[in-house]
């Protein structure tokens, strides 16, 4: 069935080299004395990307990250020595790895680093206006970074700075065991989660923190933490990880007698991201890696995108799940998880829940308590012993919107852009992986908005070496994506419409909401443009409908490439054809000489089909004829190539090979009438290669060709060196190619 195509593969796969050559990536490859470009802060107003790294903080220009300023913030030699004496790694641990980088006010940033296992914070002056061009460390004002940054650079931290107060989920001790959600800075006593209580936090890995309004009353504002942690005993058989969303009220100041300087409104719930499996056993993606909040129209109800991976070492998989805040709130208003002792099962709490309900923020909206310090003892006692909700939060549509299980990589990061297209709004996801690639995925509603189809548009390699992507930011203003890793920072445009092809059908098939056919090219779609001139169909990607008036003989206004190939009887030949789109299915037709009828080629021992084309083994005269290569995608058929194969019988070949180089045999003339002078030379070489009994390898043969070529060059100074390069090119490709475009020009595969 040629209708379906391959939806789970990226339509375009671009290598780092291809990204560079097409000017689609700008990379900052790091400094020799730095690394770990993991902490991002995007400032659209100033058009800057601030990046925290090892011993450095950078300020990159959003237009071009090659233009940057830097602050060097290392630790003292004494501090580094102390760290080394404590048995830590001098390069990987005994440095100042920046973990917190937040806007403090209009003129300053707040930054915290590991400080060689002695967390430290300071302020960075950035000036009032972008044109001030200020970027400097406040050397006179260093603060204890404990409870803000971890000691250990390997540990994750999630932080949020609002109204001069820093909320952070981190490890507060040297050993990396005392994990807590803290509120520090500001004028109040620091507040934290309960110590020594695995029901609150159980070896968590913090992902991110977000402020989300609950109502129009700011007193109801909550801070939500996303993290993963070890499942509590009794929640799961064996050791397991659970993804979590935790909430705290912004106006929580701790209890009066109990939970003094501890959160009284902390609650957490499990985030489920799973695929229903056979026998009722679901495949769970529990390792939450990243979260992105899509704020649109209503800031109280952002859509939460979560990137998850599997916990298993045997089965590696990744998924993206979407959650609605109304579902999250419903769970926090549902039953609390309860158990009577360590050996009991967790059950929904059935008893009387004290008033005001634990987890409710003290405000005029939901009751008459002005402060958490005024909360009744029974509320505090209940909150302390019931931090978890019984019901989990299920994703929208009860399943992931993106799943990847058959690949050698895992998802690490996500950012999402909402794009206006001709037929509606689409969320385009940019997903970072642990091998340095970025996937561009669009979720397209099918029958209902909840029933989404995942379309993988592109897979782009953004770093020279495979390296895990650890940070991503998206600038809607600049229409650029910024990516961080241990190795450096990369910048790429959100769209590269021209890369899809030069035809309406190709543009339409891409189903990229950013792009539309403008009559002459595939270019950026703007909703304001005149409608009738733009061709785009994201929902269906149907070029037959949208490009029908532009069709010519080949459905897309372009005649197929035509080639003539010569093969030798009993030898093999390769007909090269691979579409630009990886999603297209290729099928071949054969048309005998002087016949109208075309038949589909069936694969057997004689004919082998590969991703790159068709290999015909042990050629016979009956193989002569026209071979048509078609690409089928989304029901649209495109003829890419028409190859005419001429099979030369062995007798003729013997004649040819024994002719003098400059001989004038009539057969040679007959065969070569379609060849340029430079092609004739390598054609003879090619014949020798595929049928010579004494040359076992291509390398051996190429060596002979190059030797002869050098000899000829010495004899004839005016000779243009064309052929040896062709052979070298072939040899390079033999080492392992990853071609994505029509490269039919390559010798000696086609003439």
């Amino acid at each position: 069935n040629y209708q379906n195509g391959k939806n789970n593969v990226p339509r375009l796969k671009l290598s780092y080299k291809e990204m560079l050559e097409s000017n689609n990536v700008i990379t900052f490859n790091g400094l020799a004395n730095s690394s770990s470009y993991h902490t991002f802060l995007l400032d659209e107003e100033r058009s800057r990307l601030y990046v925290g790294a090892k011993d450095h903080i950078f300020s990159f220009d959003l237009v071009n990250i090659k233009d940057f300023q830097k602050i060097v913030w290392p630790v003292s030699y004494t501090r580094r020595d102390e760290c080394k004496w404590a048995g830590k790694d001098i390069l990987k641990e005994c440095a100042n790895f920046i973990k917190v980088l937040k806007a403090y006010n209009q003129t300053h940033l707040y930054a915290c680093g590991t400080g060689a296992f002695h967390p430290i914070c300071t302020y960075i002056e950035i000036g009032h206006h972008p044109e001030d061009n200020i970027f400097k460390l406040e050397n006179s004002h260093f603060e204890n970074g404990r409870g803000k940054s971890p000691y250990d650079p390997k540990l994750l931290t999630a932080s949020l700075l609002i109204d001069g107060e820093l909320y952070s989920g981190t490890a507060a001790d040297f050993m990396g065991r005392d994990f807590a959600i803290f509120r520090t800075l500001g004028h109040h006593h620091p507040i934290r989660t309960e110590q020594h209580d695995s029901r609150w936090l159980n070896d968590p890995k913090f992902i991110s923190a977000h402020l989300i309004s609950e109502s129009d009353n700011p007193e109801d504002d909550k801070v939500y933490f996303f993290f993963r942690e070890n499942a509590i005993d009794g929640e799961h058989s064996g050791k397991a990880t659970h993804a979590r969303i935790g909430q705290i009220c912004k106006n929580d100041f701790g209890g009066h007698r109990s939970l003094v300087n501890k959160w009284t409104t902390f609650l957490k719930a499990r985030l489920i991201c799973s695929v229903p499996g056979p026998n009722g056993i679901d495949t769970h993606f529990d390792e939450l890696q990243d979260v992105f909040l899509m704020n649109f129209k209503d800031p109280k109800n952002p859509v939460v995108y979560g990137v998850f991976t599997t916990s298993s070492n045997i089965f590696k998989g990744s998924a993206v799940c979407m959650y609605s805040m109304s579902d999250v709130r419903r769970v926090f208003l549902g039953p609390y998880a309860h158990r009577d002792g360590p050996n009991y099962q967790w059950v929904p709490y059935q008893g009387r829940v004290p008033y005001p309900r634990p987890g409710t923020c003290p405000s005029k909206t939901f009751g008459g308590f002005d402060s958490t310090k005024d909360l009744p003892d029974d509320v505090i006692t209940f909150a302390r012993s019931h931090p978890a909700m019984y019901n989990p939060v299920f994703p929208m549509n009860n399943r992931p919107i993106v799943i990847k299980t058959d690949v050698n990589y895992q998802f690490t990061q996500i950012v999402v852009d909402r794009v206006d297209a001709e037929d509606g709004q689409y969320d385009v996801m940019f997903i970072g992986t642990d091998v340095g690639t970025v996937l561009k995925v669009v979720s397209i509603p099918k029958e209902t908005w909840y029933d989404l189809e995942e379309v993988l548009l592109e897979e782009m390699t953004v770093f020279r070496e495979p390296t895990a992507i650890s940070a991503m930011e998206l600038s809607t203003k600049q229409q650029q994506l910024y990516i961080g890793s241990t190795a450096g920072v990369a910048q790429l445009p959100l769209h590269r419409c021209d890369i899809y092809g030069k035809a309406c059908a190709e543009c339409c098939l891409a189903r990229d909401p950013y792009c539309a056919w403008d009559g002459s090219a595939c270019s950026r779609y703007f909703p304001t443009a005149k409608r009738r001139t733009r061709r785009q169909d994201i929902r269906n990607g149907d070029p037959l409908t949208h490009c029908s008036d532009l069709h010519h003989d080949n459905h897309h206004g372009h005649s197929p490439e035509e080639r003539i190939i010569y093969g030798v009887e009993n030898s093999s030949t390769f007909l090269e054809c691979s579409p630009k789109s990886q999603r297209a299915l290729v099928y071949w037709q054969f048309q005998r000489r002087n016949e109208e009828r075309k038949e589909e080629i069936r694969v057997d021992d004689h004919i082998i089909r590969t991703d790159q084309g068709l290999l015909l083994r042990s050629l016979q005269q009956k193989d002569s004829g026209n071979y048509l290569c078609h690409a089928v995608e989304h029901g649209f058929i495109q003829t890419l190539l028409k190859v005419t194969l001429e099979v030369i019988d062995t007798e003729h070949l013997e004649e040819l090979l024994h002719k003098d180089d400059d001989g004038d045999g009539s057969k040679t003339k007959e065969m070569s009438n379609s060849m340029t002078p430079s092609q004739k030379v390598w054609y003879r070489d090619f014949m020798q290669l595929i049928n010579h009994p004494n040359l076992n390898t291509m390398d051996e043969f190429c060596e002979q060709v190059w030797k002869r070529d050098r000899k000829q060059r010495r004899q004839r100074p005016g000779h243009t060196p064309g052929n040896s390069n062709k052979w070298k090119h072939l040899q390079e490709n033999k080492k392992g190619r990853n071609r994505r475009t029509h490269e039919f020009e390559r010798a000696p595969r086609s003439v």
């Epitope: 404990r146 507060a172 040297f174 005392d178 110590q195 209580d197 109990s258």
Partner: antibody, heavy 123, light 111 residues
Framework: EVQLLESGGGLVQPGGSLRLSCAAS????????MNWVRQAPGKGLEWVSG????????DYADSVKGRFTISRDNSKNTLYLQMNSLRAEDTAVYYC????????????????WGQGTLVTVSS | QSVLTQPPSVSGAPGQRVTISCTGS?????????VHWYQQLPGTAPKLLIY???NRPSGVPDRFSGSKSGTSASLAITGLQAEDEADYYC???????????FGGGTKLTVL
Amino acid sequence: EVQLLESGGGLVQPGGSLRLSCAASGFTFDSYEMNWVRQAPGKGLEWVSGISWNSGWIDYADSVKGRFTISRDNSKNTLYLQMNSLRAEDTAVYYCARSGYSSSWFDPDFDYWGQGTLVTVSS
Amino acid sequence: QSVLTQPPSVSGAPGQRVTISCTGSSSNIGAGYDVHWYQQLPGTAPKLLIYGNSNRPSGVPDRFSGSKSGTSASLAITGLQAEDEADYYCQSYAGPNPYVVFGGGTKLTVL
């Protein structure tokens, strides 16, 4: 007024067992982490064991691990230390102490102490 | 041997100022953990004297003050009085194994 009152000390032979108790009053017992700290005759202080308000966290010094068991009964406002396989080096005054967490960084301090009970391990 | 190092003894005449040092390492005091001080009068239980490096619980005279720098902390007593004669212990959080550590104690003698 906060009060901690230890009991259960005495003379015991090596290899023997003892159970210490600490009765708490004057504060909300089930809100606090509690500890046992000991002091050998003429020596300094040594933290022995700690337990969280709901017994979810329990920890011991390496020197007593596997031999001592800390527990609490919040309904009785009482802290316990079960000591088995006692050795001569366990001879000390055993204090019951409340974790105050008074400092801004929540580092454990001991804001109230009992008067102590003497445990002598000797044959 | 204690993890935190204190001088075994210090002495001073009434009215004088004395300081007691407490030296740790990068995994306790040097890690940014708070230091607390206790006073143990002869034949009694220890009493919290200073918490969080420099804070006094109510009832503790302001003659007692604490400070911390790097991997060390110190307790200063000004206007020394006869009733200050006692053993003084510093204590810090140490993370697991052990949970907390004490100094070996310093005997203060008022001459």
